[in-house]
């Protein structure tokens, strides 16, 4: 039969799945079927287990005791559970690994001991668990790696020691875990690593050292030849050395943000053929562009806030698959030709020292959609610099030294920013930009060429009916945007506004001519000048 209040169902193999979770039980049910294969006793009030409390459950494969009040598990608690593969003891109040109770669970593959109060792991506690594949020890009170206890777990494939108080990883801490694929050590207090602390982890693919107190780059990773995913973000690492990942050619992902990294060795990221994304912000001591030889599949490269003054002419030869390049906030003056980077979709070079865009700089970048060159010192742009960029829709040249602006090839632009180019005083014809939605110009009179004056009045009058908004609200010069008084109407407003803009072929241009600066006067002033 099925124990009172429990839910029982066949498991499809002539055996029984029994769910007695969250029933307020203080002891184990007594009338369990010998043919039970799954027993869930989690989220109850069980505070102790007697020796041999589950007699004759020789077919039991999964036992869940999570979320109870167990402080101790006696020897013999799991006697006779010859088929047990999964044992869940998380969210209890255990203070040490129940060594005696775990003996002879030869079939056990998964053991959850997370979210207890375990501060001690006896040296021989896992010695009989020859089949163990997954071990959870996270969210406990461990202060050191239980090195000896792990020596018997040669079949272990995944382990988490996260959310403990571990401060050091000694040499060969995991020396016998040759099958381990995943190791989580995040959210500890690790400040030092033995030079050989990861030696022996020949199958490791994922290593998580995030949220620790590491002061130095973890060079011990160099023996992890199968490592695919590495995290050491949110530490206190200040530099990444030369050849940092030389032993990890399989790396696909590296997370190292939220470290005060100032310096990166030029060869640090070489020979990582699987790496797709590399992001490094604020490494102010980098003066040279990294040598990315052998890291040819990089799709996104962000290297901002450094002191890079030049790029190698062959930069694109190394990075033929690059789609996103962000080198903003550097000291770049000259630019190489990016034309070999055929897959580039986005380039961000704002806040550099660039003074000229040559004819070949961005030639034949057929996929380029966004180009940001704002806050440079660009005075010269070759007339055909943008002539072979058929996909370009966003171009930002604001805050440069332009006195003229070449329009060739820019007919597909939807966003154009030229604000802050004080020497750029000529009018730009709207006919060159049939797709334009947003344009920012140095001067308000330049918006008149885009029909902003009349259209702005038409739309404002239309939307002013029954509305007490002031004209100032409707003509925000700095934003060039209309304000909506009632937030609930925002979505409707934007939809209708978009339709109106389409209907009127209007462009959002700033700084917008206001009612006190009508286009006639502005244009008169420009003509006189």
């Amino acid at each position: 039969g099925c124990p009172t209040h429990c839910h029982c169902e066949p498991d499809g193999r002539m055996l029984l799945r029994v769910d007695c979770s969250d029933l307020g039980l203080s002891e184990l049910p007594s009338n369990l079927s010998v043919f039970t294969s799954y027993l869930d006793l989690s989220m109850n009030n069980i505070s102790q287990l007697l020796p041999n409390p589950l007699p004759s459950l020789r077919f039991l494969e999964e036992l869940r005791l999570a979320g109870n009040a167990l402080t101790y598990i006696p020897k013999g608690a799991f006697t006779g559970l010859y088929s047990l593969k999964v044992l869940m003891l998380q969210n209890n109040q255990l203070r040490q690994v129940p060594t005696e109770a775990l003996q002879n669970l030869r079939s056990l593959q998964s053991l959850r001991l997370d979210a207890n109060h375990i501060s001690y792991v006896p040296p021989s506690c896992f010695s009989g668990l020859h089949s163990l594949r997954h071990l959870w020890l996270d969210d406990n009170a461990l202060t050191e790696i239980p090195v000896q206890a792990f020596r018997s777990l040669s079949a272990l494939q995944a382990m988490t020691l996260a959310l403990n108080k571990i401060h050091h990883i000694p040499d060969y801490a995991f020396g016998n875990l040759s099958s381990l694929v995943v190791l989580h050590l995040h959210n500890n207090r690790i400040h030092s690593l033995g030079k050989k602390c990861f030696d022996g982890l020949h199958s490791l693919e994922t290593l998580d050292l995030n949220y620790n107190n590491l002061d130095e780059f973890p060079t011990a990773i160099r023996t992890l030849s199968n490592l695919k995913e590495l995290g050491f973000h949110s530490n206190n690492i200040r530099s990444i050395p030369e050849k940092a990942f030389v032993g990890n050619p399989s790396l696909i992902t590296i997370h190292f943000y939220d470290n005060p990294i100032q310096f990166v060795g030029r060869s640090a990221f070489q020979h990582l053929p699987e790496l797709r994304t590399l992001t490094l912000n604020g490494a102010s001591q980098i003066t040279e562009f990294p040598d990315l030889t052998g890291t040819a599949n990089l799709e996104s490269l962000t290297l901002t806030g450094a002191q890079i003054s030049s790029l190698p002419q062959t930069v694109c030869n190394q990075l033929p698959n690059l789609q996103v390049l962000d080198l903003s906030y550097n000291l770049l003056e000259d630019l190489p030709s990016f034309s070999v980077c055929q897959k580039l979709q986005k380039i961000d070079l704002r806040h550099n020292e660039i003074y000229e865009i040559k004819v070949d700089t961005f030639q034949q970048l057929l996929s380029l959609r966004s180009l940001n060159l704002a806050w440079n010192k660009i005075a010269i742009i070759h007339p055909n610099a943008f002539s072979t960029l058929p996909s370009l829709i966003k171009l930002d040249l604001s805050s440069n030294l332009l006195s003229s602006f070449p329009v060739t090839g820019l007919h597909g632009l939807t966003h154009l920013k030229l604000t802050g180019n004080h020497a750029l005083q000529s009018l730009i014809s709207s006919e060159n930009f049939p797709e334009l939605k947003i344009i920012e110009m140095p001067y308000a009179y330049q918006c008149c060429a885009f029909g902003v004056c009349e259209n702005a009045y038409k739309i404002s009058n239309q939307w002013n009916k029954g509305d007490n908004s002031s004209m100032d609200d409707l003509h925000k010069k700095d934003a060039g945007m209309f304000q909506v008084q009632d937030e609930r109407d925002l979505e409707d407003f934007l939809l209708d506004f978009e339709e109106d803009l389409k209907a009127l072929h209007s462009v959002q241009c700033s700084p917008s001519p206001g009612p006190f600066k009508p286009c006639e006067h502005l244009l008169d002033g420009w003509l006189i000048r």
């Epitope: 040499d171 060969y172 020396g175 030696d199 020949h202 160099r222 023996t223 030389v246 032993g247």
Partner: antibody
Amino acid sequence: EVQLVQSGAEVKKPGASVKVSCKASGYTFSAYWIEWVRQAPGQGLEWIGEILPGSDSTDYNEKFKVRATFTSDTSTSTVYLELSSLRSEDTAVYYCARGGHYGSLDYWGQGTLVTVSS
Amino acid sequence: DIVMTQSPDSLAVSLGERATINCRASESVDNYGNSFMHWYQQKPGQPPKLLIYLASNLESGVPDRFSGSGSGTDFTLTISSLQAEDVAVYYCQQNYEDPFTFGQGTKVEIK
């Protein structure tokens, strides 16, 4: 099958340098340390130092720090020991060995006899 | 440096009898419960061969008549039943700290 094959015997004059090679095969070259050990005729074993191939990670016995240099070439899976300023007491068989389980030396090269004689 | 002292320097044992070699370290070579002590066998004209790692773990392929024990500073290699092919020099080695050091060797012969 793991193998370490060393270069042939060398005869050198005092003050000269010698470069011994150790070619590894049968395992992931960059995942294991290579140790260098020497044995003078009829004597015991003396550890010179270690290198993790492909990286700049090296450790030298203080006694050899000034004169010994370890290098590696990942393209050929070869590690090198160069010993300079040779003297007669450097006459020995020089072994490379792989640092295996817990740093024990689980595979050894056949040894290279270096004779220093004027 | 950690000094490794083996005793005896040489040992003659009858075939089938037990041979015991001791090794003492000048300081403990234990770390986090592991004893960083290894044993090697070297036959004439050959490189050393690993027998035992971490004081008591038998290396793969090594006959089980070889065993190791001890911790801290005192360690023992035992050959439970000496065979003719066991004639060799045996070395202990520590890799607890640099420089890694070897014992002076113990020569095992047949009585």
